[in-house]
């Protein structure tokens, strides 16, 4: 039960995390104009991974896509790549984890296969979360560097008296969404990996041995190994049938794991 809960919770947390990574990647507010200690302008600039926007006090918002690939900073390209890799891995992880869920029965899939799939999806979620966190952190570092550079020469003199204001950018909402989402995906992945340990059957299956005593024919089945599958008291804990009708094929698919005398 605890394994199912851990797996299910891991799946849900990862799902929320990946949705957050997708949202962060699509958001326009990766960097926003720093309003602190700045002259009050009637325009508010903010930038995303794919386009930059300007919101005027008139209510008019204009966004322009980055219609160049080669002209963009390498760091921005790297962040894009990390976020996309994170989304792709997360999406594949979600797909795999759906089939790995203990509460879902697909044909004659063994628990060992489900355990492997749970572990695979868990690792994918961990890598996905790390990609997102790395992408957001790289962008944040880029912002901090640029912020202090532009602060150093915030007002650049132009022709003596005339001044031009340099727009400084600070952390946008997408960064926080990305960090939280990456963290959730990472946590979800760890939970899936933990659930995998509970799902995995022990490799050693103790074969039942027949002992023939005089006058009696008793078959002894060694029990007491909680982790062993299909033996002793553990059979009672094994939920072979998930409720509802089963086809004969489905029922027949399970006894292959059990050894009978």
């Amino acid at each position: 039960m605890a394994v199912t809960a851990c797996q299910g919770l891991g799946f849900v947390v990862s799902l929320i995390g990946i949705a957050g990574i997708i949202a962060a990647t699509c958001m326009d507010q990766w960097s926003t104009q720093d309003l602190y200690n700045n002259p009050v302008t009637a325009v508010f600039n903010y930038q995303g991974l794919w386009r930059s926007c300007v919101r005027e006090s008139s209510g008019f918002t204009e966004c322009r896509g980055y219609f160049t690939l080669l002209g963009l900073p390498a760091m921005l390209q790297a962040v894009r790549a990390l976020m996309i890799v994170g989304i792709v891995l997360g999406a594949i992880g979600l797909l795999v984890s759906i089939f790995a869920l203990k509460c879902i029965r697909i044909g004659s899939m063994e628990d060992s296969a489900k355990a492997n799939m749970t572990l695979t999806s868990g690792i994918m979620f961990i890598v996905s979360g790390l990609c997102a966190i790395a992408g957001v952190s790289v962008f944040a570092n880029m912002l901090v560097t640029n912020f202090w550079m532009s602060t150093a020469n915030m007002y650049t003199g132009m022709g003596g008296m005339v001044q031009t204001v340099q727009t400084r950018y600070t952390f946008g909402a997408a960064l926080f969404v990305g960090w939280v989402a990456g963290g959730l995906t990472l946590i979800g992945g760890v939970m899936m990996c933990i659930a995998c340990r509970g799902l995995a059957p022990e490799e050693t299956n103790y074969k039942a041995v027949s002992y023939h005593a005089s006058g009696h024919s008793v078959a002894y089945k060694p029990g007491g190994f909680k982790a062993s599958t299909g033996f002793g008291s553990n059979t009672k804990n094994k939920k072979i049938y998930d409720g509802g009708a089963r086809t004969e094929d489905e029922v027949q698919s399970y006894p292959s794991k059990h050894d009978y005398v």
Epitope: P39, V43, S52, E56, S57, S58, G59
Partner: antibody, heavy 118, light 113 residues
Framework: EVQLVESGGGLVKPGGSLRLSCAAS????????MSWVRQAPGKGLEWVST????????YYPDSVKGRFTISRDNAKNSLYLQMNSLRAEDTAVYYC???????????WGQGTLVTVSS | DIVMTQSPDSLAVSLGERATINCKSS????????????LTWYQQKPGQPPKLLIY???TRESGVPDRFSGSGSGTDFTLTISSLQAEDVAVYYC?????????FGQGTKLEIK
């Protein structure tokens, strides 16, 4: 068709108060920034206040800050300018205007005259 | 505050001739985010409210004759009327729409010579 109609102007004594109204129609009022601009007799244009579209932030020049308050009622499609502690130099025609691209003012009302005199 | 200085204060031009009005701001009105200059030009005739001619320094408002054009960037801007018509007699104002407070130039009175 965009229409802006100002009202509430008149004669007031120095130190007195007045509330100007601007009834808007022909557009989604809440989405646009709105401004008040004044023009003293025979003088140039002077920006008085702006209330931004959406978030309703308000802005004023130092000459009226603390004395004038711009507000809007999106349900009534109305813009207001509450003027307190009026001075003789506040005498002007007050125009209500709607913002658009570049924070420009493509639509203006016909104006309402405010005279501050003892 | 941003100071907007127009020149000349008044201008007399013959019908059909080119009229040029200049506007200088004390700070750059160029927004790096969209590379647009937040400068606006208005025309005001006696007894009427101002009429928008040009926004973003060079974008003509719809319905404005194409003889009106705006140019310039940063701090120096120009309004040009390529061929003056009788109906163009008015006072012209430039306005800073980038920094608060939004400041107007003192106006340029355009007359027919």
């Amino acid at each position: 068709e965009v229409q802006l109609v100002e009202s509430g102007g008149g004669l007031v004594k120095p130190g007195g108060s007045l509330r100007l109204s601007c009834a808007a129609s022909g557009f989604t009022f809440s989405s646009y920034g709105m401004s008040w601009v004044r023009q003293a007799p025979g003088k140039g244009l002077e920006w008085v206040s702006t209330i931004s579209g959406g978030d309703s932030y308000t802005y004023y020049p130092d000459s009226v800050k603390g004395r004038f308050t711009i507000s809007r009622d999106n349900a009534k499609n109305s813009l207001y300018l509450q003027m307190n502690s009026l001075r003789a130099e506040d005498t002007a025609v007050y125009y209500c205007a709607r913002s658009y691209n570049g924070n420009s003012l493509p639509y203006w009302g016909q104006g309402t005259l405010v005279t501050v005199s003892s | 505050d941003i100071v907007m200085t127009q020149s000349p204060d008044s201008l007399a031009v013959s019908l059909g001739e080119r009229a040029t009005i200049n506007c200088k701001s004390s700070q750059s009105l160029l927004n790096s985010g969209n590379q647009r200059n937040y400068l606006t030009w208005y025309q005001q005739k006696p007894g009427q409210p101002p009429k928008l001619l040009i926004y973003w320094a060079s974008t003509r408002e719809s319905g404005v004759p194409d003889r009106f054009s705006g140019s310039g960037s940063g701090t120096d801007f120009t309004l040009t009327i390529s061929s003056l018509q009788a109906e163009d007699v008015a006072v012209y104002y430039c306005q800073n729409n980038y920094f608060y407070p939004f400041t107007f130039g003192q106006g340029t009175k355009l007359e027919i010579k």
